[in-house]
Interface confidence: low
């Protein structure tokens, strides 16, 4: 029987700069029941606080709700693992909420074959930003990426859409069924998961009108 191994805070993510969650990996348990606690203080403060919510983020997590989240302050946190034989501490992690944002996937992905008059047809892909993101405040710039492939193909074709919430794709294989997905990331932060796939059947006459 041994003291617990050193835990590691391996990930912190925020969906929208208003709340965030951190997760840790336990070290070895030393063969004994082990308790974990996360403590933190904000840069410039000396007062230590304990994690306000160990439940919302699931096992081995700490969730910081709105009232505990400030995008203007750096959080310095560590995890303490304790059993009957002793304690061990993770390394301190410095967390700036601005840099840990991982939005939800974009919403309302709509894909349609468009045929403007006397123009080559194209795939028009349109989506909405994730609900939790408030773009009106100007705190966020969301960037988008699209991927698509014929249903049976192995390779995805990737297109960077910048800040647009719609995108045109011209070169497609007639008669094929395509999968289309979109994801987003803030200017500083992480890519969201891909949105659920939308399927679109490309007509076999996907050619110029004239």
């Amino acid at each position: 029987q041994l003291p617990p191994g050193k835990p590691e805070i391996f990930k912190c993510r925020s969906p929208n700069k208003e709340t965030f969650t951190c997760w840790w990996r336990p070290g070895t348990d030393g063969g004994l029941p082990t308790n974990y606690s996360l403590t933190y203080h904000r840069e410039g403060e000396t007062l230590m606080h304990e994690c306000p919510d160990y439940i919302t983020g699931g096992p081995n997590s700490c969730h910081f709700g709105k009232q505990y989240t400030s995008m203007w302050r750096t959080y310095i946190m560590m995890v303490n693992a304790t059993n009957q034989m002793g304690s061990s501490f993770s390394d301190e992690l410095y967390v700036d909420v601005t840099y840990i944002v991982q939005p939800d996937p974009p919403l309302e992905l709509a894909v349609e074959v468009k045929q403007p008059e006397d123009r080559k047809p194209y795939l028009w892909i349109k989506w909405s930003p994730p609900t939790l993101i408030d773009l009106k405040t100007g705190w966020f710039t969301l960037l988008y990426e699209i991927r698509l492939k014929p249903e049976k193909a192995a390779e995805w074709e990737i297109h960077f859409a910048g800040q647009q919430t719609e995108f045109k794709i011209l070169s497609l294989h007639p008669g094929q069924k395509y999968l289309v997905q979109v994801r987003c990331k803030p200017d500083h932060g992480y890519w969201s998961a891909w949105s659920p796939a939308t399927f679109i059947q490309i007509p076999s006459d996907f050619t110029m009108n004239d």
């Epitope: 709509a110 349609e112 008059e117 006397d118 123009r119 009108n209």
Partner: antibody, heavy 118, light 111 residues
């Protein structure tokens, strides 16, 4: 046989609302764009709005933007035009039309008359 | 201002050839968008007469033909008949309006 049958027209006061319907039959409604086009008494044709097959995309003439809403119910094979804040200059026969491939209007209904007057 | 300009009226005698013009701009016909022509007989709904500049739907007699050049298009009717008396409209997509434009219409009278 392709058929488009408009309904819902009538007399309405300025500022009022009407909803026009266009019942389609004789073709796979969900495979086509659809349009509303109007014709004021003794005047020419004026395009009002169009809507894509799955309702993802809509376009409007500047004269009706913000007041009219085009929609469709593919399960009912029906096209709609919700007209709000109606003005005297909206008085016209309203036609629905089917948009074939490049959206050219290949079949038209017989029209329904909307009269806006106090 | 995006407009398609047509002569308000045209006329001819039976058997004659009549041409109706449709003049647009760089945001519609001149942009490369195709032109469609519609015929509206008195008291009826419009009917597609010519599509994609010069194509005839099935059932339209070959007396009707269309052409396009630059920012203009024209509809020609040869071997004019009394039943051709109608209003004729050109239409094209307009890029700046992101919508359809109809010409003002030409009333054709068969004398």
């Amino acid at each position: 046989e392709v058929q488009l049958l408009e309904s819902g027209g009538g007399l309405v006061q300025p500022g009022g609302s009407l909803r026009l319907s266009c019942a389609a039959s004789g073709f796979t409604f969900s495979s086509y764009w659809n349009h509303w086009v109007r014709q004021a008494p003794g005047k020419g044709l004026e395009w009002v709005s169009d809507i894509s097959r799955a309702s993802s995309y809509t376009n409007y003439a500047d004269s009706v933007k913000g007041r009219f809403t085009i929609s469709r119910d593919n399960s009912k094979n029906t096209l709609y035009l919700q007209m709000n804040s109606l003005r005297a200059e909206d008085t016209a026969v309203y036609y629905c039309a089917r948009g074939l491939d490049a959206r050219r209007m290949d079949y038209w209904g017989q029209g329904t008359l909307v009269t806006v007057t106090s | 201002q995006s407009v398609l300009t047509q002569p308000p009226s045209a006329s001819g005698t039976p058997g004659q050839r009549v041409t109706i013009s449709c003049t647009g701009s760089s945001s519609n016909i001149g942009y490369g968008y195709v032109v469609h022509w519609y015929q509206q007989l008195p008291g009826t709904a419009p009917k597609l007469l010519i599509y994609r500049n010069n194509q005839r739907p099935s059932g339209v007699p070959d007396r009707f033909s269309g052409s396009k050049s630059g920012t203009s298009a024209s509809l020609a009717i040869s071997g004019l008949r009394s039943e051709d008396e109608a209003d004729y409209y050109c239409a094209a997509w307009d890029d700046s309006l992101n919508g359809w434009l109809f010409g003002g219409g030409t009333k054709l009278t068969v004398l």
